[in-house]
Interface confidence: low
């Protein structure tokens, strides 16, 4: 498997790394055990089944999910298509007349920019 680079690297991918300090001996996931917190769904569990890949992901190296197109996350649990805001991609800024908006996980959040010309 070669390196892949994505706009938003996440635990589910072999994330592109911009330095060579760390040897590439372990998949780019961070399973974390918590003795006091029982599993509460795939996104909230601090200890996930390492063979569990959702949305058609393929388990590789025993603990790493190779996700199909548009899915990401350490278990392929996130769907980029559901997180876009219409035609605005996830994690993208959209300038409007008197505000600056950002698409974040399917919600367009706008921040007033009163300092712009013609904006009170």
């Amino acid at each position: 498997l070669g390196h892949q680079e994505f706009a938003r690297p996440s635990r589910g991918y072999l994330a592109f790394r911009d330095d060579s300090i760390w040897p590439q001996e372990e998949p780019a996931i961070r399973p974390r055990s918590s003795q006091r917190v029982p599993p509460m769904g795939i996104q909230h569990s601090k200890e996930l089944n390492r063979t569990c890949c959702l949305n058609g992901g393929t388990c590789m190296l025993g603990s790493f999910c190779a996700c199909p197109p548009s899915f990401y996350g350490r278990n392929c649990e996130h769907d980029v298509r559901k997180e876009n805001c219409g035609s605005v991609p996830h994690d993208t800024w959209l300038p409007k007349k008197c505000s600056l908006c950002k698409c974040w996980h399917g919600q367009l959040r706008c921040f007033p920019q009163a300092f712009l010309p013609g904006c009170d």
């Epitope: 635990r11 760390w22 040897p23 961070r30």
Partner: antibody, heavy 119, light 112 residues
Framework: QVQLVESGAEVKKPGASVKVSCKAS????????IHWVRQAPGQGLEWIGE????????NYNEKFKNRVTLTVDTSISTAYMHLSSLRSDDTAVYYC????????????WGQGTMVTVSS | DFVMTQSPLSLPVTPGEPASISCRSS???????????LEWYLQKPGQSPQLLIY???NRFSGVPDRFSGSGSGTDFTLKISRVEAEDVGVYYC?????????FGQGTKLEIK
């Protein structure tokens, strides 16, 4: 080169809140976790929590869970630690540290921010 | 919580002599994925901590080979084969397998 630069020292009164920032440079911010660790004067290190800038996921030390909020602004590669309801025993140096995806280690640390809580 | 107990708390060493620090966890810190996320950090006087060893025995980039880590399960050791003056500071073990992540209380190494 990798750098984590924290905001300046703060002096707060008991009951107040503080927000410490940690500006990252020299690497892809969303590819590494950010940890927060504190050290009271003359004491050891205490882990507060960690934040994954790529998706906002957090793990907290239960001791701080009701008072601390970890956030990031990926547009400026900056992480924040907000601690509320400050007490005198919150007086400490607060460090941010980078956590690689591949291991749990904290490989680069900020210089620390001294937060003093005093009436 | 996973309590990490270090010994000794103070370690006076003659330059050139070996040094050894023990770290014991209250429960096994082997993660369910089979890895043991036991790390060692050194905090030199007036500085931020720095990573020495990760995953029990792996030296971090730039760490001299006189530092070595070993152990398994609940018992871990950091060894310095020949102590140098620049090694003074407080050494912390740390477990990253289970939330909350926890540090040992620290071992202060000083030169005799």
């Amino acid at each position: 080169q990798v750098q984590l630069v924290e905001s300046g020292a703060e002096v707060k009164k008991p009951g107040a809140s503080v927000k410490v920032s940690c500006k990252a440079s020299g690497y892809t911010f969303t590819s590494y976790w950010i940890h927060w660790v504190r050290q009271a004067p003359g004491q050891g290190l205490e882990w507060i929590g960690e934040n994954d800038p790529s998706n906002g996921r957090t793990n907290y030390n239960e001791k701080f869970k009701n008072r601390v909020t970890l956030t990031v602004d990926t547009s400026i590669s900056t992480a924040y630690m907000h601690l509320s309801s400050l007490r005198s025993d919150d007086t400490a140096v607060y460090y941010c540290a980078r956590g690689p995806n591949y291991f749990y280690s904290m490989d680069y640390w900020g210089q620390g921010t001294m937060v003093t809580v005093s009436s | 919580d996973f309590v990490m107990t270090q010994s000794p708390l103070s370690l006076p060493v003659t330059p050139g002599e070996p040094a050894s620090i023990s770290c014991r966890s209250s429960q096994s810190i082997v993660h369910s994925n089979g890895n043991t996320y036991l790390e060692w950090y050194l905090q030199k006087p007036g500085q931020s901590p720095q990573l020495l060893i990760y995953k029990v025995s792996n030296r971090f980039s730039g760490v001299p080979d006189r530092f070595s880590g070993s152990g398994s399960g609940t018992d871990f050791t950091l060894k310095i084969s020949r102590v140098e003056a620049e090694d003074v500071g407080v050494y912390y073990c740390f477990q990253g397998s289970h939330v909350p992540l926890t540090f040992g209380q620290g071992t202060k190494l000083e030169i005799k």
